[in-house]
């Protein structure tokens, strides 16, 4: 019979023949002949290979560097790579996440629309009218302006995007 | 090995723009953020902001906000820092910095002179 | 901002001899993840600062063993154990424990 020009999925073509490829978490030790099987091996420990393949070398787990402010999210299996993260307060800088960035935090007139995670930064927002933020911060959101009225109390000093209102006693010399 | 190449020294006039920029070679650019660091002469340093070329989200000092602009551009590796309404005292030395674990690489710097 | 104070500002040192530097902050630099975030750079004369030590005490790749930093949450020191004249330069220490990263004004360490 003519020698096959393609093969079938999970089959790649060598010799003119189509060898099963190795499953992922297995490596090729050896092609198939017209007599024998595609032989594979386990990657070993700290390794893995991820898609069928034929790759005669497994890929190493990364290394989640504590000196680089990482960690590991998720421990590496013979067909996964391990997932790192930062430490806490930081975030990675790519999805890569091979380095980390410090979670910003939101300057007074901003709030904390999102907090920051593994993986994305604080998002800020503008205080709106009738809220403020007086501080820096990466966990505070807008807090509402007090309302005088309902302490009995009238506006004295109007509140900003960074203050609140100042409250003070009624007049009492009303007619 | 990696290096951050800046462009070279820039003498400007009061009220004007310059726009530095920085060449990383030797490691993968969007896996680290580009920071700008300044020492006016005889002076301290002083931190201006960072670029995340990843995303291309920038974090500024409140002090440059409004004056600043950090940009990557990925297809170069270069990243850049633009100051605007440039006045006497920003007359200093610019450097770009890796962070890693640390500003564990820095470019060789650019002087910026400004002068009427 | 949180403000970084070195001292002293000159350090006229004999080589050979031991060298401490002290850098105070005007908050924390203990995150509550336990690192402390207080690095310390040397600037050489006519070059780019270099990284001496990172997180407090850790010393950097390449970095000779006579250097060595410590502290606490606001009070830090740079030692060097025996100075040598390739040493002599401007040392900062700064913080990252939140925006806008800060500096110390920088010790200026030179051979007596």
């Known amino acids: 019979p003519e020698p096959p020009t393609a093969c079938r999925e999970k089959q790649y073509l060598i010799n003119s023949q189509c060898c099963s490829l190795c499953q992922p978490g297995q490596k090729l030790v050896s092609d198939c002949t017209e007599f024998t099987e595609t032989e594979c091996l386990p990657c070993g420990e700290s390794e893995f290979l991820d898609t069928w393949n034929r790759e005669t070398h497994c890929h190493q787990h990364k290394y989640c560097d504590p000196n680089l402010g990482l960690r590991v999210q998720q421990k590496g299996t013979s067909e996964t790579d391990t997932i790192c993260t930062c430490e806490e307060g930081w975030h990675c800088t790519s999805e890569a996440c091979e380095s980390c960035v410090l979670h910003r935090s939101c300057s007074p007139g901003f709030g904390v629309k999102q907090i920051a995670t593994g993986v994305s930064d604080t998002i800020c927002e503008p205080c709106p009218v009738g809220f403020f933020s007086n501080v820096s911060s990466a966990f505070e959101k807008c807090h509402p302006w007090t309302s005088c009225e309902t302490k009995d109390l009238v506006v004295q000093q109007a509140g900003t995007n960074k203050t609140d209102v100042v409250c003070g006693p009624q007049d009492r010399l009303r007619a | 090995e990696v290096q951050l190449v800046q462009s070279g020294a820039e003498v400007k006039k009061p009220g004007s723009s310059v726009k530095v920029s920085c060449k990383a070679s030797?490691?993968?650019?969007?896996?680290?953020?580009m920071h700008w660091v300044r020492q006016a002469p005889g002076q301290g340093l002083e931190w201006m902001g960072y670029?995340?070329?990843?995303?291309?989200?920038?974090n500024y000092n409140q002090k440059f906000k409004d004056r600043v602009t950090l940009t990557a551009d990925k297809s170069t590796s270069t990243a850049y820092m633009e100051l605007s309404s440039l006045r006497s005292e920003d007359t200093a030395v610019y450097y770009c910095?890796?962070?890693?674990?640390?500003?564990?690489?820095w470019g060789q710097g650019t002087t910026v002179t400004v002068s009427s | 901002d949180i403000v970084m104070t070195q001292s002293p500002l000159s350090l006229p040192v004999t080589p050979g001899e031991p060298a401490s530097i002290s850098c105070r902050s005007s908050?924390?630099?203990?995150?509550?993840?336990?690192?402390?975030?207080l690095y310390w750079y040397l600037q050489k004369p006519g070059q780019s600062p270099q990284l001496l030590i990172y997180?407090?005490?850790t010393l950097a790749s390449g970095v000779p063993d006579r250097f060595s930093g410590s502290g606490s949450g606001t009070d830090f020191t740079l030692k060097i154990s025996r100075v040598e004249a390739e040493d002599v330069g401007v040392y900062y220490c700064?913080?990252?424990?939140?925006?806008?990263?800060?500096f110390g004004q920088g010790t200026k360490l030179e051979i007596k």
């Open positions: 997180r407090m005490s």
């Open positions: 030797g490691y993968t650019f969007t896996s680290y953020t």
């Open positions: 700064m913080q990252h424990l939140e925006y806008p990263l800060t």
């Open positions: 670029i995340n070329p990843s995303s291309d989200y920038p």
């Open positions: 908050k924390s630099l203990l995150h509550s993840n336990g690192n402390t975030y």
């Open positions: 910095a890796r962070w890693g674990y640390s500003f564990d690489y």
